[in-house]
């Protein structure tokens, strides 16, 4: 049994780190493998993560952790029974992938504005809470040529779009993702998309 692609891990900077790797051949990850992890810290214990399959040769493990601080460093050991397949380390603060924003809602009853709101995925006491910026992707299933990214660089999880900039009488979808500038993170996954119908019509005199 061999590791084809070594484990690569990212942390949500809250309570979960996710490690993914590929094996040399088809593997029943949960039955054959264990990923052991231990914080390099006085009197810490070794904890075990049972991986799940992620495609035929891929495995993924969700490591449960306490809150993350910059000093945290983990040793990782990938075992197949009594055989040590791989040994490595992981510093969560240096490999952060934020949680995806949630509760994306579109408000179309605000005069001539489409208002999008969503929730910050972190509690106020988390370091990422005040560091997230967002990208909102808006596209139309009726008009495949239309797709826009709106960068939200302010803290408030809202975006206002003049309804007049969207075509009337067609449906649009939106989704949002986040990243944290000062923690040099990757982008989060996209939130689930939400759909709305743009029924806005310009006043007669502006036509």
């Amino acid at each position: 049994m061999k590791v084809l692609q070594e484990p690569a891990c990212v942390s949500d900077y809250m309570s979960i780190s996710t490690c993914e790797w590929k094996m040399g051949g088809p593997t029943n990850c949960s039955a054959e493998l264990r990923l052991l992890y231990q914080l390099v810290f006085q009197s810490s214990e070794t904890h075990t993560c049972v991986p799940e399959n992620n495609g035929g040769v891929g495995c993924v493990c969700h490591l449960l952790m306490d809150d993350v601080v910059s000093m945290d460093n983990y040793t990782l050991d990938l075992w197949a029974g009594q055989q040590l397949l791989w040994k490595g380390s992981f510093k969560p603060s240096e490999h952060v992938k934020p949680r995806a924003p949630g509760n994306l809602t579109v408000h179309t009853n605000v005069s001539d504005t489409v208002l999008l709101t969503w929730s910050n995925p972190y509690p106020p006491d988390n370091y990422l809470y005040n560091d997230l910026t967002y990208a909102v992707n808006i596209w139309s299933e009726n008009d495949p040529a239309y797709s826009r990214i709106h960068n939200v660089t302010y803290l408030k999880p809202t975006l206002r779009i003049p309804a007049s900039t969207l075509k009337s009488g067609i449906s649009y979808r939106a989704r949002v993702r986040a990243w944290a500038q000062h923690y040099n993170t990757t982008w989060s996954e996209w939130s689930p998309s939400t759909k709305w119908y743009n029924s806005y019509r310009e006043p007669f005199e502006q036509r």
């Epitope: 914080l39 006085q42 009197s43 810490s44 214990e45 306490d66």
Partner: antibody
Amino acid sequence: EVQLVESGGGLEQPGGSLRLSCAGSGFTFTDFAMTWVRQAPGKGLEWVSSISGSGGNKYYADSVKGRFTISRDNSKNTLYLQMNSLRAEDTAVYYCAKDRLSVTVRPRYYGLDVWGQGTTVTVSS
Amino acid sequence: DIVMTQSPLSLPVTPGEPASISCTASQSLLYSIGYNYVDWYLQKSGQSPQLLIYLGNKRASGVPDRFSGSGSGTDFTLKISRVEAEDVGFYYCMQSLTSPYTFGQGTKLEIK
């Protein structure tokens, strides 16, 4: 009541052995790391050894490494310190103390918040 | 090893007056914000040590509020706002960030 009671001290010749015990009660013994600290006559406190809750991680002062062995029997709620190749400079009162909560991924520390009454070890010919 | 240096080593105090003991570590004991791995212990004559302060500034259960800890990184202070006769004994700082745990030399507090 959270309590630690040491036993096993006594007079031993240089080169001899002693085994100290520390019985814990009033707390979930297996969840906590444990520590031994000693105090030579008229001197200050000196850390000797620590062990994680599961017993999987052990730590020793350089002065006792290779001679002393820390262990625990969680089924008996008891901590041990096996002392071999004793030297005159090992003469001290030995205390066991309750250390950090080690079942969490990052052990939670509340200080060495409970100490035993101490057991005296005298190494002399 | 981390060296803990305490001062003063002897501290005569009048009852009702404040007292202060300093402890300097040879390297930072700050693991994360608010988590300085330094404790303060009092050992009264013929007794086991007792915990006063842990993680730099957290008062242990049952410890009178006249005891307080402060500092961060390498410099720490134990303050007693009004010394009482029962406070006499040896005070020790200790770092528990990493093994080997190390203690300061001890400060003998006595009543004038």
